[in-house]
């Protein structure tokens, strides 16, 4: 299998809505028409697929409309975006890229980022 | 010359799983990608898939997802498509398909066909 | 998922007669569209790609034009081997799919 690089920040915090957003940048080694991108999640030594997406290069990324993600695409860039995040989410996002079409193919993992989530503290019962 | 050599007809019964093999000369195996097409009687034809040869990696139609298998054995050349718990309405031919590419027009077509492989569902 | 739709289903001509099949897309494809021919009991052919380019060893009676979501096949001067089906093919974005075919028949 054909290798590219794969970059992604190592540490990411989320907002306190439970947001977190990080580039996943690849080094396209060719002209690729078609990307898949996927977002793994590894937590415990068990590794499950968060979201995914397939688009076509100058176009927009279009995940299902169930996903917890959302995206855009800028040459070899993804901005990702995770919403509805909690404490328990915390852990290993992991970036993973392919070149789909055309041929040759060429698969791409990042290294991680960490999603640090802490859930808000609730407001304090008020006597006003 | 190039060609693409399928096996032969099948018959299986509803709930069994079929494997039909494909297998290529006369070009490099592992440059192109292998499409596997589907045509069920007096329908129209209906993309399955793809396998790329050389790393294995595999594209799947939502359709067939969960459904289809496709795999290669570059020892032979081959690339299979295994696909399972068979019902009446996937009886069809079955046809791979080579993936061809022009890096100047920049676009994709199937230029080499087998000759289509018949799976019959019937209890 | 981008659909496909030809027209028309069927066409019956002579031989000799120019004979033009339409393919409209859901969304735009660019020209990332190609043409198959089919005789019964055979496997499709190539005979375009890129929308208009002519594949090698396809006769050039045969071409195609279009870009965008509205795409065309045509038949300068029909002969006795061109009775088949025709089918288009979207290479834009998987899933690759194809139109429900023409048939081309023997007026």
């Known amino acids: 299998c054909k290798a590219m690089h794969v970059a992604q920040p190592a540490v990411v915090l989320a907002s306190s809505r439970g947001i977190a957003s990080f580039v996943c940048e690849y080094a396209s080694p060719g002209k690729a028409t078609e990307v898949r991108v996927t977002v793994l999640r590894q937590a415990d030594s068990q590794v499950t697929e968060v979201c995914a997406a397939t688009y076509m290069m100058g176009n927009e990324l279009t995940f299902l409309d169930d996903s917890i993600c959302t995206g855009t695409s800028s040459g070899n860039q993804v901005n990702l975006t995770i919403q509805g995040l909690r404490a328990m989410d915390t852990g290993l996002y992991i970036c993973k890229v392919e070149l789909m079409y055309p041929p040759p193919y060429y698969l791409g993992i990042g290294n991680g980022t960490q999603i640090y989530v802490i859930d808000p503290e609730p407001c304090p019962d008020s006597d006003f | 010359q190039v060609q693409l050599v399928q096996s032969g007809a099948e018959v299986k019964k509803p709930g069994a799983s079929v494997k039909v093999s494909c297998k290529a000369s006369?070009?490099?195996?592992?440059?192109?990608?292998m499409h596997w097409v589907r045509q069920a009687p007096g329908q129209r034809l209906e993309w399955m898939g793809w396998?790329?040869?050389?790393?294995?990696?595999?594209n799947y139609a939502q359709n067939f997802q969960g459904g289809v298998t496709m795999t290669r054995d570059t020892s032979i050349n081959t690339v299979y498509m295994e696909l399972s718990s068979l019902k009446s309405d996937d009886t069809a031919v079955y046809y791979c398909?080579?993936?061809?590419?022009?890096?100047?027009?920049?676009?994709?077509?199937?230029?080499?066909w087998g000759q289509g492989t018949m799976v019959t569902v019937s209890s | 998922a981008i659909q496909l739709t030809q027209s028309p289903s069927s066409v019956s001509a002579s031989v000799g007669d120019r004979v033009t099949i339409t393919c409209r897309a859901s969304q735009g494809i660019s020209s990332w569209l190609a043409w198959y021919q089919q005789k019964p009991g055979k496997a499709p052919k190539l005979l375009i790609y890129a929308a208009s380019s002519l594949q090698s060893g396809v006769p050039s009676r045969f071409s195609g034009s279009g870009s965008g979501t509205d795409f065309t096949l045509t038949i300068s001067s029909l002969q006795p081997e061109d009775f088949a089906t025709y089918y288009c093919q979207q290479v834009n974005s998987f899933p690759w799919a194809f139109g429900q075919g023409t048939k081309v028949e023997i007026k």
């Open positions: 396998v790329d040869p050389h790393s294995g990696a595999t």
């Open positions: 006369g070009y490099a195996f592992d440059g192109h990608y």
């Open positions: 398909a080579r993936d061809f590419y022009d890096t100047s027009a920049k676009s994709g077509a199937f230029d080499i």
